[in-house]
Structure formats: C-alpha cells, structure tokens
C-alpha cells in the first residue's frame, strides 16, 4: 500500500475580516493510526491551531466528523477571521507513539490572506487659521487595511489636488497596514465654503471609496476691508460717519471708534449680514456733534478681527463754520447699526 500523503489542495485562501476561513486537508490513507494537528507557520516557533486529540479551540470547527473510523477529511473552519490570522497553515499527520505521538507527514501548506477594510479616513487641518494666498497642510490617515495595495486621492471642491505626499506603513510584510498623506492647499478668499476631501480606494470597498472631509471654514481667516464715509448732515450740528467692514471671516470682530485718538466707543459685531461666499459684512455708524469741536476732527475706525492686530481707517471731518452752540457737551452719539446686504 502507498505511503500516506497529506493533501492541502489550496495553495492560498483569501478571506474577508469577520468571515470564516475553510482550510482543506485530506489524507490518502488511514494508516498509520494517529491524530492530525494544524499549525500556523513551520519550524520550532510554529503555533498550534487545532489538535484532534486534545485541547480547547473555540474558533475552530472540523468540516467532517473526525471520530469516525474511516474519516480521511481533516479540513477545518476558523471563525471570525482578523488580519492577525494571516499566515501559512499546515495540516500535519502524527503517528501514534509512546509516550508521545511522532510527526509523520505534513501538507504543503495553505496561505491564508485576510482582506480588511481601511478605517474611515480622518482629515485634520492646521492648528491655527491662515489667510488667503497662504499654503496650509492637511493630513489624512486610515488604518487597519489588508492587503497593502491602496490608492489615496485629495480633492478641493471636487477638483483633484496634486501636491501631496503619501506613505503606507509598515514597508515590509504585515497583518495590516496604515496610510498617511499630507496635502498642501493654497487658500483663496472664496474658500469659506470650500471642502478638502481625502478619498481612499481599496479592494475591500468594492468600488465605493471611503471619504474624509475637512471644512476650510475651520482653517481660513479672511481679513476685513474697511471703508469710512461721511453721510449727509443729519441735523444742522450733527454728522453721520459710517464704517463699512466688508468680507471678513470668521465673525469674531470688535470695532472701536476714535476721535482725535481718543476712544469714543467700542462694540462687538453681532447682527452681521452674510455674503454668498460665506464672508460677513457689518456696518457701524457714529453721530458726531460738530458743535462740540473747535478744530477739524480725525475719526478712526479701528477693527480687531479674530484676535489679530488691529487694522484701522481714518476720516478727516472738516469743522469749517460752527453753528450756534446748543448747550450740548456730547461730542458723539453712541449708535450702532447693521446694514442690509447689498451684494
């Protein structure tokens, strides 16, 4: 009779994480008598996966009934596969011995490969806000995928970005992999509503890539433009001066009126109007009582936006002919207002 052979018909088996792997093994003879054991890996450091004779292997079930006398099918199923289960599995026949069974013959091995989905990409932007025309970096990370082959792309508002650097780790063989990418994005004044998207394509995703997003509203700071204008005289001794604060983002803004360098009033932007591009407009006015001034008045609108150094715009108010004093000591009436969006 021919000597027993251990047949592992599958050179490789590919299983998705969470599924059950079937590792096939048959013997060509019932002789010699002795148990079968399954190992992952070869040599002295091999890991016991299943022992027909003894032990508790909760994730392993046999395909056929190994207690039957004429059984020659030693295939096993391993449940709830994870990337850590990847490796080469050997079906090994032992010959009954005393005191210990002796290894008789091994199958050629079956390589178990595990397909694991990448985690949802996480996109993070810079810690501090930046202004238009500046270049900022975004990072994208995704973990736990297998096999290693993966494709990552960056988009801004649906347009592909080309300035990025991507690494997949580790470089060598591993049960699972991570991807890390850094993209450079040049900000524009219109980017308040913009999105940066990191997209990852992998065999496990079946043509439906995973996306991670970052809103540039959390990254951009659009500094305001200021315009100070003198309105027509409201009463014979009062002049209305307005400060238009336009196209700023975020909303956090404090405005201070100065008369000849002295603080007249400070207010915080509250009722702002929003432009189509996501930036804000705001207007403040100051009623100046010209009868309280003997000389020309320098009015300054000073704006501190989002904790940045103040910017200001001045207007020289000509006090040419004084009307008769009307007993008012007040140089300015403290009035604030918001404008309607005219854009």
């Amino acid at each position: 009779e021919e000597e027993l052979q251990v047949i592992q018909p599958d050179k490789s088996v590919l299983v998705a994480a969470g599924e059950t792997a079937t590792l096939r093994c048959t013997a060509t003879s019932l002789i010699p008598v002795g148990p079968i054991q399954w190992f992952r890996g070869a040599g002295p450091g091999r890991e016991l996966i299943y022992n027909q004779k003894e032990g508790h292997f909760p994730r392993v079930t046999t395909v056929s009934d190994l207690t039957k006398r004429n059984n020659m099918d030693f295939s096993i199923r391993i449940g709830n596969i994870t990337p850590a289960d990847a490796g080469t599995y050997y079906c090994v026949k032992f010959r009954k011995g005393s005191p210990d069974d002796v290894e008789f013959k091994s199958g050629a091995g079956t390589e178990l490969s595990v397909r694991a989905k990448p985690s949802a990409p996480v996109v993070s932007g810079p810690a501090a806000r930046a202004t238009p025309q500046h270049t900022v970096s975004f990072t994208c990370e995704s973990h736990g995928f297998s096999p290693r082959d993966i494709t990552l792309k960056w988009f801004k508002n649906g347009n592909e970005l080309s300035d990025f650097q991507t690494n997949v780790d580790p470089v060598g063989e591993s049960v699972s992999y991570s991807i890390h990418s850094t993209a450079k994005v040049v900000l524009t004044r219109e980017d308040v509503h913009s999105q940066v998207i990191c997209e990852v394509a992998h065999v496990t995703l079946q043509g439906d890539p995973l996306r991670g997003t970052a809103n540039l509203s959390e990254t951009i700071r659009v500094p305001p433009t200021l315009e100070v204008t003198q309105q027509p005289v409201r009463a014979e001794n009062q002049v209305n001066v307005t400060c238009q604060v336009r196209k700023f983002y975020p909303q956090r803004l404090q405005l201070t009126w100065l008369e000849n360098g002295n603080v007249s009033r400070t207010e915080t932007a509250s009722t702002v109007t929003e432009n189509k591009d996501g930036t804000y407009n705001w207007m403040s006015w100051l009623l100046v009582n010209v009868s309280a001034h003997r000389d020309d008045v320098k009015l300054t609108c000073q704006v501190e936006h989002d904790g940045q150094p103040a910017v200001s715009k001045s207007h020289d108010l000509k006090v040419s002919a004084h009307p008769k004093e009307q007993g008012s000591n007040t140089a300015a009436e403290n009035t604030g207002s918001n404008e309607r969006n005219i854009y």
Partner: antibody
C-alpha cells in the same frame, strides 16, 4: 520626469511567445498598479491585464486568460507581459499604463508610447 | 463581462461648438467610469475619472456626467486640438472594459 518605455515587441509566428517589458522612471514604481492595454490596427482600445503595486494581485481579460502572464520587478522598476500561444488576433500596439496608486482605481493616468506585436506566419 | 457601448461612432462638429458623447454600460458601474482621449499615432490620455472628476491638467471645457449605466462626456467649446478619438472605460468589475470609441471630427 515620469516616463514609461515599452520594449520586446516584434514579429512572431502563431503559437509562438514574446515577452514585453515596460521600464518606468521618475516615480516610485512600487506605489502604482500597472496595466497593459492593446490596440489592434484601426481598432479601439482593449484592456488586457493589470497588476497591483505589490504584485500580489493580478487580473486578465477573458481573451488572454491562461495564455498571458503579467508580472513586475519592483527592484528594477519594470513591468512584464509574458505572451504564450500567440494568435493572429493578438496583433496590436501594446501600451503599458499606470494607475493613480497601488490599487487599480480612478483610471490610468500615465501611459507609455507602445510597442508593436505582429503575429503572422 | 460588462459591455460598454459608445454613441455615435463618429461625430462631426464645428470648432467652437459643443460636443456631446455618450457611453452606456450593460449593467450598473456606479460612478466608476473613466474617459480617455487618443490622438492619431499617440498614446491615450486620461480626461475624466469617477464619471465627472477632471484629471490633473485637463481644461475646464471637458466635463463628465452620469452614473449607473448612462454617461456623457461634454466638450463645451471645441478647440482644434480636441478632434480625436474618445473612449469610456468602466473600472467597477473585472475585467475592466472599454467602449468601442467615438471619433470626433471637424465638420
């Protein structure tokens, strides 16, 4: 500069074999899945085969399955197509092309200039 | 395998005019579709992927639309360099397959 240069084309008899090569430069070759696409004289494009960046995964068109083998040597930055049992209908210009990453997705964005294979007795 | 059908086979349009090319898949390919341009004697060039995303360096006059089985490539104002062959390709299912092509010629 990103470049891909095919070679190995020529005249071969039906039933014969040829091995095409595609030498890549200017990019990290192992980070990109690669493909072979062919175009018969006066005809359209036909996708032939693809291989992932690591080389662990390969795919073939039904018309070449069992006859053609795609492989890559990442240490040499070279893609190969071993063509056996060649037929007259395999006559075409063969292009190598690179995908956007090591998994074949998003289309092929870098192409070589092609090498001509003629199968005739 | 998924069969990709392009229409028309030949399209005659005057420079400056709009060109609309169609591509139909025999079963859904989601949005996993690319468009390529090929000029005579040259290698193909990727124009659009993901059905509607322009590849790097492709002019804004090229736009793609559609999902599932019906796709369109539109060239808004034809330039002389746009007269060429155009191919759609699905990358949703193996084997990846091309359409038979549309030849865009000067009217």
């Amino acid at each position: 500069e990103v470049q891909m240069l095919e070679s190995g084309g020529g005249l071969v008899q039906p039933g014969g074999s040829l091995r095409l090569s595609c030498a890549a430069s200017g990019f990290t070759f192992s980070s990109y899945a690669m493909s072979w696409v062919r175009q018969a004289p006066g005809k359209g494009l036909e996708w032939v085969s693809a291989i992932s960046g690591s080389g662990s995964s390969t795919h073939y068109a039904d018309s070449v399955k069992g006859r053609f083998t795609i492989s890559r040597d990442n240490s040499k930055n070279t893609l190969y197509l071993q063509m056996n049992s060649l037929r007259a209908e395999d006559t075409a210009v063969y292009y190598c092309a690179a995908y956007s990453g090591s998994y074949y997705y998003y289309g092929m964005d870098v192409w070589g200039q092609g090498t001509t294979v003629t199968v005739s007795s | 395998e998924i069969v990709m059908t392009q229409s028309p086979a030949t399209l005659s349009v005057s420079p400056g005019e709009r060109a609309t090319l169609s591509c139909r898949a025999s079963q859904s390919v989601s949005r996993n579709l690319a468009w390529y341009q090929q000029k005579s004697g040259q290698a193909p060039r990727l124009l659009i992927y993901g059905a509607s995303t322009r590849a790097t360096g492709i002019p804004a006059r090229f736009s793609g639309s559609g999902s599932g089985t019906e796709f369109t490539l539109t060239i808004s104002s034809l330039q002389s360099e746009d007269f060429a062959g155009y191919y759609c390709q699905q990358y949703n299912n193996w084997p990846y397959t091309f359409g038979q092509g549309t030849k865009l010629e000067i009217k």
